[in-house]
């Protein structure tokens, strides 16, 4: 007896009869930048404050007839999805609406900027609890809109935006492409990407996660008790804004980085049929559907990590790609991936006082991606130890030699174009898990971290015969921090983390003879923090 | 999600020093850039967001806006300052002819200029 979308985001423990999770986001204020709204609709009456902010362009067309209920349609529905009495996600959240979209649902980058500035000034004048800003709109890529979002996010505001309804790479749109914003794609009742006419949800590495966005029942501006179904990435973003409000109400001190990691962690994994996405976007698009956490507390003990893909490097010989973590996150490992298999590896390097992950294209390569593993590790002290190419035939190796430092990731980078083509695999000597091993022509980089209670272990999975994909996963209670391929397999396209699984991809097996060179080994570094677990037990 | 990518047009105008000296050259070594939406139907030429360098104060933003208006007037162009930004980004929103872009890019404190564009409900 509840709408499918509310059931979908609700963990089983709340599903007894009705959707009634505890504490409906009452400590949080959600700002909505959208059309005008019907604030006396029963779903939202008394919980949405219409601000006096309005910055909209004139409607197109001389014969446009401004009908109140149509002008309010989009915003009213979204306000209802976020905080509606009956069909809302965060039934206790209070909202403030700013009108930046006209009766045709059209606005401007400049109007949105002025709206964001209005929110920042309001926050300074009257500081309240946690703020969530919902931006259910999209335009072309805009440097200035992304910059404004970055500034607002760094002022402690959580921004949630629609990925866009253009069946396209979300990185081509703003604010969807802003790294600091939580960007949400849309899925349907079958957990499939939403199709909207000839278009549909956007996808790609700029999407953080998906959420219900098709046939979403919500407040209709047609009448004060009416409901209507609407679809789009706006509806999906509204779900995530509601979930964020719930999480922040339960834990008001959560930072943006912590919130994003929790949203990812509690999402349903690997339920989306990736065949809907263009082939080149499948690996980049997160297979995550948002859900509420099963309980309001107890997540603090977890070591949270996420995978961040860079933009494509482009095909030039010296092209590089850089993946960055958020300011509050630690880069615990760095890997690379190339569809052609022609790459020169990757390295962790300092940039502006922070480690970044840089991948290098090779001559004749179509380009590379850098893949950063970004984690929340309080009081961490991480450094990169590098070993230059070795002369010895045993290959290059490097370990974490500082007292109390553990290995969280391995990277290798080489200057030669045809590394390892005719060389046998180099195997890690047993009993030395705290070191990285690589080709003798490669420089090897070990990510070594010290943090209270941090412990890590190496897990390998090798397949002797050629395989397009080899995976190794960390067990329950452990979090994947590093993912790499054991050297010696020249046909490896790269390695990357998907949730808690390390994936090593190889060239199409039909093009690889089943020689010893066909052996592929995936190496995962799995970590956990006893300190975080103890701290959470003490809280409880 | 990266700030610096996207199917995105960046027009870096290599500025010649042929101006009449009324505009101070930007701090040496930095060239202000012009950006516009890659999706042509979404462009809104005639309105521009002038973004100033990060630490620019409100008074400097207002002064830069007035300076642009004065220099535009000398060339016979009408401009209108629609909004002065402060709190998030320093800068201002100006309604002006695209002919004035080269002039605006030479103003002191200018980091980049972006042509306004449309956004849509999703």
């Amino acid at each position: 007896s509840i709408p499918w979308n509310l059931e979908r985001i609700t963990p089983p423990r709340y599903r007894a009869d009705e959707y009634q999770p505890p504490d409906g986001g009452s400590l949080v204020e959600v700002y909505l930048l959208d059309t005008s709204i019907q604030s006396d609709h029963r779903e939202i009456e008394g919980r949405v404050m219409v601000t006096d902010f309005e910055n909209v362009p004139e409607e197109d067309g001389t014969r446009f007839h401004r009908q109140a209920s149509k002008c309010d349609s989009h915003g009213t529905h979204l306000a209802g999805v976020v905080s509606g009495r009956d069909a809302g996600v965060a039934k206790g959240a209070s909202m403030r609406s700013l009108r930046v979209l006209n009766c045709q649902g059209k606005g401007t980058v400049s109007g949105t900027l002025i709206g964001l500035e209005f929110i920042r000034k309001s926050q300074l004048v009257q500081p309240v609890g946690p703020l969530v800003v919902l931006l259910p709109l999209a335009g072309g890529y805009s440097r200035v809109l992304n910059a404004a979002c970055q500034r607002l996010a760094r002022a402690g505001v959580v921004l949630v935006t629609a990925a866009g309804n253009f069946r396209d790479d979300a990185c081509l749109y703003s604010p969807a492409s802003a790294p600091e914003v939580i960007t949400v794609g849309a899925t349907n009742a079958q957990d499939q990407p939403v199709t909207l006419g000839t278009l549909g949800t956007n996808f790609g590495r700029c999407v953080d996660l998906f959420a219900p966005g098709e046939d979403i029942i919500g407040a209709s501006s047609d009448c004060s008790t009416c409901f209507v179904s609407q679809s789009g990435t706006s509806q999906a973003a509204a779900h995530v804004a509601g979930i964020a409000a719930m999480m922040l109400s339960a834990e008001p001190e959560l930072t943006l980085a912590e919130l994003r990691q929790r949203l990812i962690h509690f999402s349903a994994k690997d339920v989306i049929n990736e065949a809907w996405f263009p082939e080149d976007q499948r690996v980049l698009t997160p297979n995550l559907v948002a859900a509420l956490p099963p309980s309001t507390h107890g997540a603090g003990w977890q070591l949270f990590c996420r995978t961040v893909w860079s933009a494509h490097s482009g095909p030039t010989r010296m092209a590089t790609a850089v993946a960055r973590c958020a300011p509050d996150e630690e880069l615990l490992s760095c890997s690379s991936f190339s569809r052609s298999g022609k790459r020169r590896g990757e390295r962790m390097e300092a940039q502006g006082g922070k480690l970044v992950c840089r991948a290098h294209n090779a001559f004749g390569g179509e380009g590379v991606y850098a893949i950063a593993r970004c984690c929340l590790l309080p009081q961490a002290n991480c450094s990169v130890h590098t070993a230059p190419p070795a002369e010895a035939s045993m290959g290059t190796r490097v370990h974490c030699h500082q007292q109390g430092h553990v290995l969280t990731g391995c990277s290798s980078h080489w200057e030669v174009e045809d590394l390892g083509t005719h060389k046998p695999p180099v195997l890690r000597p047993r009993g030395q898990p705290n070191q990285c091993v690589g080709h003798r022509e490669a420089s090897i980089h070990a990510s070594c971290c010290h943090a209270p209670g941090l412990e890590c272990k190496v897990k390998e999975h090798g397949i002797p015969a050629p395989q397009e994909q080899v995976t190794v996963a960390c067990e329950e209670g452990w979090t994947l921090t590093g993912c790499s391929a054991l050297p010696g397999t020249s046909h490896v396209l790269g390695a990357y983390a998907v949730d808690n699984t390390c994936v090593v991809r190889s060239r199409d097996v039909s093009t690889t003879g089943s020689t010893s060179e066909g052996a592929v080994t995936a190496v995962a570094i799995c970590c956990r923090s006893r300190h975080l677990a103890q701290a959470s037990q003490e809280l409880q | 999600q990266e700030d610096e990518d996207g199917d995105y047009e960046e027009l870096v105008l290599a500025l010649r020093s042929e101006e009449d000296g009324l505009a101070e050259a930007p701090e040496h070594g930095t060239t202000a850039t012009f950006h516009r939406c890659a999706k042509d139907p979404w462009r809104l030429p005639g309105t521009y967001v002038v973004v100033l360098k990060e630490e620019t104060h409100l008074s400097q933003s207002e002064r830069t806006a007035r300076r642009l208006q004065a220099q535009a007037a000398r060339r016979g162009y009408l401009t209108k300052i629609l909004h002065v930004f402060h709190g998030l980004l320093p800068g201002f929103l100006v309604k002006m002819s695209g002919d004035l872009l080269e002039l605006a890019l030479k103003l002191p404190h200018v980091d980049y200029i972006e042509e306004d564009s449309s956004v849509f409900a999703q």
């Epitope: 007896s1 509840i2 709408p3 009869d17 009705e18 959707y19 009634q20 006396d40 029963r42 209920s69 009495r85 009956d86 069909a87 039934k91 029942i217 047609d222 009448c223 004060s224 008790t225 009416c226 409901f227 | -």
Partner: antibody, heavy 126, light 106 residues
Framework: QLQLQESGPGLVKPSETLSLTCTVS??????????WSWIRQPPGKGLEWIGS???????YYNPSLKSRVTISVDTSKNQFSLKLSSVTAADTAVYYC??????????????????WGQGTLVTVSS | EIVLTQSPATLSLSPGERATLSCRAS??????LAWYQQKPGQAPRLLIY???NRATGIPARFSGSGSGTDFTLTISSLEPEDFAVYYC????????FGGGTKVEIK
């Protein structure tokens, strides 16, 4: 079959608080599909909606009565109640409780009032 | 608030005749209008909802029409049990009822 039954004092003094309870039988009050409403009818006059509540206790009141009205719900007893403060003779009416389909679950039926209780007359007099 | 004005206040007709009741809204209520029947000593009963849809169990002689501000309830051939008071109600904005039309036997 769902039935609603109003109960409470038939006589209230001016300036006091009118209190009525509606007991729902033949169905559960704890459903997202419905709102539970109070409507009144002064003798020989038309109907006036007072306010509504859902099983979660979320209320929605007539703006003209909002300052005086409190509606509450007790799901364990399958009841909802009305309190109207500072009453005057103008509040003398037959008070009805009724179910209203919320519209959230379209299958629940049309978004209007029905069924109704049989009504209880409350007289405000000293 | 939206005011609903019903006319006539009283309609005197004989069984078998056609009854036409009018309800006018002070502003558009789109099609969000219902008709109720109330007999003496009883609670109202829903007849027509969303301007023209018959509620469950309501005979076909009852029909509703109109949208925006002007609405009509028609009883094609009055039966003895149809003599009662009829109210219109809108839900475009909050809930308001009309003053009622009494259909009495002539």
């Amino acid at each position: 079959q769902l039935q609603l039954q109003e109960s409470g004092p038939g006589l209230v003094k001016p300036s006091e608080t009118l209190s009525l309870t509606c007991t729902v039988s033949g169905g559960s009050i704890s459903s997202a599909s419905y709102y539970w409403s109070w409507i009144r009818q002064p003798p020989g006059k038309g109907l006036e909606w007072i306010g509504s509540i859902n099983y979660r206790g979320s209320t929605y009141y007539n703006p003209s009565l909002k300052s005086r009205v409190t509606i509450s719900v007790d799901t364990s007893k399958n009841q909802f109640s009305l309190k109207l403060s500072s009453v005057t003779a103008a509040d003398t009416a037959v008070y009805y409780c009724a179910r209203e389909n919320s519209g959230v679950v379209p299958a629940a039926g049309p978004n209007w009032f029905g069924p109704w209780g049989q009504g209880t007359l409350v007289t405000v007099s000293s | 608030e939206i005011v609903l004005t019903q006319s006539p206040a009283t309609l005197s007709l004989s069984p078998g005749e056609r009854a036409t009741l009018s309800c006018r809204a002070s502003q558009s209520v789109s099609s969000y209008l219902a008709w109720y029947q109330q007999k003496p000593g009883q609670a109202p009963r829903l007849l027509i909802y969303d301007a023209s849809n018959r509620a469950t169990g309501i005979p076909a002689r009852f029909s509703g029409s109109g949208s925006g501000t002007d609405f009509t309830l028609t009883i094609s051939s009055l039966e003895p049990e149809d003599f009662a008071v009829y109210y219109c109600q809108q839900r475009r904005n909050w809930f308001t009822f009309g003053g009622g039309t009494k259909v009495e036997i002539k």
